[in-house]
């Protein structure tokens, strides 16, 4: 499955929306920064199978959707930008679902995907626990926004690599 150009553009649009969503200065939140342990190994160029990477992307977008569609998130961000962000994520989920159904078939791959999906879920669990611990403060959301932007930009770069391999 060739990840379509539109998916990469969608990812860029999602990044731009995330960037626009910022409400307070990053710089008042330096002390709140946190290492969430992004599971980079899941996406590593040397060891990932294509199906594994696509499954991990899918899970990452799904979890981002879940994170930003909570009541606490709605209170933190501009509603119009948030709605646009949902649309981009939803479009990307559709793109990736088409890819996942094409790529996944062999049982071993499905098992391997389980590990990568679990790693992504644990990553988002850490993010959720951090937000809870910080009582969903504006700075906590700001830190999380930067983290999601970083993981999105990482996956955008990787998608370019995936497309080149085809």
């Amino acid at each position: 499955c060739d990840l379509p150009q539109t998916h990469s553009l969608g990812n860029r649009r999602a990044l731009i929306l995330l960037a626009q969503m910022g409400r307070i200065s990053h710089f008042s939140c330096l002390k709140d920064r946190y290492d969430f342990g992004f599971p980079q190994e899941v996406f590593d160029g040397n060891q990932f199978q294509k199906a594994q990477a696509i499954s991990a992307f899918h899970e990452m977008i799904q979890q981002t959707f879940n994170l930003f569609s909570t009541k606490d998130s709605s209170a933190a961000w501009d509603e119009t930008l948030l709605d646009k962000f949902y649309i981009e994520l939803f479009q990307q989920l559709n793109d990736l679902e088409a890819c996942v159904t094409q790529e996944v078939g062999v049982e071993e791959i499905a098992l391997m995907n389980e590990d990568s999906i679990l790693a992504v879920r644990k990553y988002f669990q850490r993010i959720t626990l951090y937000l809870m611990g910080k009582k969903y403060s504006p700075c906590a959301w700001e830190v999380v926004r930067a983290e999601i932007m970083r993981s999105f930009s990482f996956s955008t770069n990787l998608q370019k690599g995936l497309r080149r391999k085809d």
Epitope: L15, G22, R33
Partner: antibody, heavy 120, light 111 residues
Framework: QVQLQESGTVLARPGASVKMSCKAS????????MHWVKQRPGQGLEWIGV????????TYNQKFKDKAKLTAVTSANTAYMELSSLTNEDSAVYFC?????????????WGQGTTVTVSS | DIVLTQSPASLAVSLGQRATISCRAS??????????MHWYQQKPGQTPKLLIY???NLESGVPARFSGSGSGTDFTLNIHPVEEEDAATYYC?????????FGSGTKLEIK
């Protein structure tokens, strides 16, 4: 590829003001912070401040708060720094640099630098 | 402001040997798993180049002979084996709090 093109050498009188530019290309200008850094001849680097072109948000090193003013014009993909009330201490090379990895606040791409010479 | 003290101010290392540069912060620049210390290389007449970010992460395209370590207040940049093209001034920079500051630089000469 990412490029930051800075304006040329500036010669100015003490007490005057200068405005230098930094034109960005090869990336989404509005979604990356832009830092400005000072380097005096044969000396180290000093962080002046940073601007977010997307909304014009700025943060300054207190030392440069009354010296430097950062602005950006998104339609031109260009960031600007204006230095006022120039003294000999302001003679230096000034770099614009792109912020890297969001809130890690390090700098991956650098302009070639604008040389400012203050002399009467 | 956090003061970064680099040592030595200059060093000469033979080709193929190890160069070790230290950077000490006047206050911790580490928080919740990350150390906000970064390393740059500046060759004469050129702009600085990012080598290492977050104390130990090698920037893309930077040779593996460069490595960074440390946390809290003490950080080290290692170059091994040193090559001719590594002759430059090396700066550490922190982003632990405002204002961000740089070390005074270490000039590396290749013997």
């Amino acid at each position: 590829q990412v490029q930051l093109q800075e304006s040329g050498t500036v010669l100015a009188r003490p007490g005057a003001s200068v405005k230098m530019s930094c034109k960005a290309s090869g990336y989404s200008f509005t979604t990356y912070w832009m830092h400005w850094v000072k380097q005096r001849p044969g000396q180290g680097l000093e962080w002046i401040g940073v601007i977010y072109p997307g909304n014009g948000d700025t943060t300054y090193n207190q030392k440069f708060k009354d010296k430097a003013k950062l602005t950006a014009v998104t339609s031109a993909n260009t960031a600007y720094m204006e230095l006022s009330s120039l003294t000999n201490e302001d003679s230096a090379v000034y770099f614009c640099t792109r912020n890297y990895k969001y809130d890690y606040y390090t700098m991956d791409y650098w302009g070639q630098g604008t040389t400012v010479t203050v002399s009467s | 402001d956090i003061v970064l003290t680099q040592s030595p101010a200059s060093l000469a290392v033979s080709l193929g040997q190890r160069a070790t540069i230290s950077c000490r912060a006047s206050k911790s620049v580490s928080t919740s798993g990350h150390s906000y210390m970064h390393w740059y290389q500046q060759k004469p007449g050129q702009t600085p180049k990012l080598l290492i970010y977050l104390a130990s992460n090698l920037e893309s395209g930077v040779p593996a002979r460069f490595s960074g370590s440390g946390s809290g207040t003490d950080f080290t940049l290692n170059i091994h084996p040193v090559e001719e093209e590594d002759a430059a001034t090396y700066y550490c920079q922190h982003s632990g709090e405002l204002p961000f500051t740089f070390g005074s630089g270490t000039k590396l000469e290749i013997k």
